[in-house]
């Protein structure tokens, strides 16, 4: 089976059940339902999944049975629309049920909430978790899928199956260990952090497809796969891009069974043809399916062929450039992107796409000119500033990170971004700036050749978080402009923003800067978030405050927290010293 199976199936649900097996089928239907109805209780979803599974089994037994010929969207949509509390829980989303397919599914997709109003997941004691795991392993693992899926409605479903497999393995191993907590907690922390990163990466892929279209996603995929598989032929890369686009289009569109099935087919194809693709795939291809697919997605770049010729000859110096471009524009531009990307694993994907866009714009202009060759002869010179801009930015920011460390680097970014877009909500600014700040520890340790792809492509993922959160409640025209004008220029757009001079400072509210003894029991991370929240609020009150003023206030604040957390009567200390701190801060900032 290729990724594009053209063989008709009488029953799509039976086909997918047989391809995926009962366990994966049930898990994927649960993920799909939880990503659509994010507020529904776990038990309700399990009931719906069991009903769908029983129905699928009847179709496997007899594909001609009643309703077995219906599309998966029809079957799943009908099932979701049986939820009794749909109107009360979801409001206008209930109106989706009055629509016919495919409009009904589109309606459900539009109501996916990137920031659902759900309680933070609190991790129980290790013994409590191990007891729950042993008492009912199946329910325990389903609960994991449900809780992640409803909080991350665009999580890459087949990859979530891989996370669940690792989650199960962690409990299986650690609940038997002498020191359960020492074994389990680091593994759960790692899964949580990797899961958040995976969710954010997939969110960018879905945004790329949904907001900028298939061509934008395909261009991204050509660049990335050409860097990863520089020995592969252009047609091989093109085939992988076409198949990968289909997989991600399906997952982003809620077609999770098709997506998982096609992803498995793609992994199979890659492994069967690894000699033509990459020398780095051998280990991945020896793994079981879920591990194999994950491994392929993360595989390191293959070595570049030694004898690659100069690009200038055929893409700039040749008199046939316009003829070749006119013959098949997208193939010619695709080849340009492929050839440039496989030579530049040291560039970010977004930079490669900017270069391709510049090249395309130049050809569009020059091929209509009197002397096309003269016109496009210097096109590669236009690339220089585009390459130098991210290089310089990364150099400066890595120097700043090395000087400050992660926490203070995050604070510098908090101040920078709050001044750029002060209308954005404080929790969003804190979350996004903290993630932007993590670029330092993630990428600055790398040698020069790996810094840009690490940093700029990571920043694209984080800025997309800002874009999707802002889209839900738009408050800043500048954010909207940077998010919607060009996918590849989002980071340069945000970098170029200066202080928003139109912003009217927020009224001072002492309550915002009132702290209590509960801060002392928080983890270091939670305490940092409290301090960073205060910092954002300070900048919103006094956007013209200097770095020195803000540093002085934050140092005083840190000393105040440390002092009161050591006091015998903590609450009294926070009340009395807090008033003094607020007064001193107001004076220091001229509030």
């Amino acid at each position: 089976r290729g990724v594009f199976r053209r063989d008709a199936h009488k029953s799509e649900v039976a086909h997918r059940f047989k391809d995926l097996g009962e366990e994966n089928f049930k898990a994927l239907v649960l993920i799909a339902f939880a990503q659509y109805l994010q507020q529904c209780p776990f038990e309700d979803h399990v009931k719906l999944v069991n009903e769908v599974t029983e129905f699928a089994k009847t179709c496997v037994a007899d594909e001609s049975a009643e309703n077995c010929d219906k599309s998966l969207h029809t079957l799943f949509g009908d099932k979701l629309c049986t939820v009794a509390t749909l109107r009360e829980t979801y409001g206008e989303m209930a109106d989706c049920c009055a629509k016919q397919e495919p409009e009904r599914n589109e309606c459900f997709l539009q109501h996916k909430d990137d920031n659902p109003n759900l309680p933070r997941l609190v991790r129980p004691e290790v013994d409590v978790m191990c007891t729950a795991f042993h008492d009912n392993e199946e329910t325990f693992l389903k609960k994991y899928l449900y809780e992640i899926a409803r909080r991350h409605p665009y999580f890459y479903a087949p990859e979530l199956l891989f996370f669940a497999k690792r989650y199960k393995a962690a409990f299986t191993e650690c609940c038997q260990a002498a020191d359960k907590a020492a074994c389990l907690l680091p593994k759960l922390d790692e899964l949580r952090d990797e899961g958040k990163a995976s969710s954010a990466k997939q969110r960018l892929k879905c945004a790329s497809l949904q907001k900028f279209g298939e061509r934008a996603f395909k261009a991204w995929a050509v660049a990335r796969l050409s860097q990863r598989f520089p020995k592969a032929e252009f047609a091989e890369v093109s085939k992988l891009v076409t198949d990968l686009t289909k997989v991600h289009t399906e997952c982003c569109h809620g077609d999770l069974l098709e997506c998982a099935d096609d992803r498995a087919d793609l992994a199979k194809y890659i492994c069967e043809n690894q000699d033509s693709i990459s020398s780095k795939l051998k280990e991945c291809c020896e793994k079981p399916l879920l591990e194999k697919s994950h491994c392929i997605a993360e595989v390191e770049n293959d070595e570049m062929p030694a004898d690659l010729p100069s690009l200038a000859a055929d893409f700039v110096e040749s008199k046939d450039v316009c003829k070749n471009y006119a013959e098949a524009k997208d193939v010619f531009l695709g080849m340009f992107l492929y050839e440039y990307a496989r030579r530049h694993p040291d560039y970010s994907v977004v930079l490669l796409l900017r270069l391709a866009k510049t090249y395309e714009t130049t050809l569009e202009k020059c091929c209509a000119a009197a002397d096309p060759h003269e016109c496009y002869a210097k096109v590669f010179d236009e690339f220089k500033p585009l390459v130098e801009e991210p290089q310089n930015l990364i150099k400066q920011n890595c120097e700043l990170f090395e000087q400050l460390g992660e926490y203070k680097f995050q604070n510098a970014l908090l101040v920078r971004y709050t001044k750029k877009v002060p209308q954005v909500s404080t929790p969003t600014l804190v979350e996004v700036s903290r993630n932007l700040g993590k670029v330092g520890s993630k990428c600055c340790k790398h040698p020069e050749a790996k810094r840009m792809p690490c940093a700029e492509d990571y920043l694209s993922v984080v800025l997309n978080q800002l874009c999707v959160l802002h889209e839900k409640t738009p408050v800043s025209d500048r954010v909207t402009k940077c998010c919607t004008e060009s996918l590849v220029n989002r980071r340069p757009c945000f970098s170029a923003l200066e202080v928003d001079e139109t912003y009217v400072p927020k009224e001072f509210n002492a309550e915002t800067f009132t702290f209590h003894a509960d801060i002392c029991t928080l983890s270091e991370k939670e305490r940092q978030i409290k301090k960073q929240t205060a910092l954002v609020e300070l900048v919103k009150h006094k956007p013209k405050a200097t770095k020195e003023q803000l540093k002085a206030v934050m140092d005083d604040f840190a000393a105040f927290v440390e002092k009161c957390c050591k006091a015998d009567d903590k609450e009294t200390c926070f009340a009395e010293e807090g008033k003094k701190l607020v007064a001193a801060s107001q004076a220091a900032l001229g509030l």
């Epitope: 252009f234 047609a235 033509s276 062929p305 004898d307 010729p309 055929d314 013959e327 098949a328 193939v331």
Partner: nanobody, 125 residues
Framework: EVQLLESGGGLVQPGGSLRLSCAAS????????MGWFRQAPGKEREGVSS????????FYTNSVKGRFTISRDNSKNTLYLQMNSLRPEDTAVYYC??????????????????WGQGTLVTVSS
């Protein structure tokens, strides 16, 4: 429509060299991926080497790497295959093929759209 005409085949001793040529005519953009294939008696046709006439990237099957070199002269619309250190197992009919770079894959002859008639290379002492 595209026409391809190979030349340069012949009898050569093991360790010797040959240079094959392939002249292309017609809509040359349709031939911006060009390759050499070979078919030994009783065996399937296999890819030897390919080149993009835009970009100049080259690809070789493992058994000929370091011995064969593909090149092209765009001004003459001609493809070449320089074969050195020839071995008896290189004996085959060598075909020139062309197609779209978005489709052509050296391991799959069906992805090439245009074919020459072939030229015989015999390596024997």
């Amino acid at each position: 429509e595209v026409q391809l005409l190979e030349s340069g085949g012949g009898l050569v001793q093991p360790g010797g060299s040959l240079r094959l040529s392939c002249a292309a005519s017609g809509n040359t953009y349709l031939t911006s991926c060009m390759g050499w294939f070979r078919q030994a008696p009783g065996k399937e046709r296999e890819g030897v080497s390919s080149i993009y006439t835009v970009g100049g990237s080259t690809f070789y099957t493992n058994s000929v790497k370091g011995r064969f070199t593909i090149s092209r002269d765009n001004s003459k619309n001609t493809l070449y295959l320089q074969m050195n250190s020839l071995r008896p197992e290189d004996t085959a009919v060598y075909y020139c093929a062309a197609g779209s770079p978005a489709r052509c894959r050296l391991r799959d002859p069906t992805t090439f759209d245009y074919w020459g008639q072939g030229t015989l290379v015999t390596v024997s002492s």
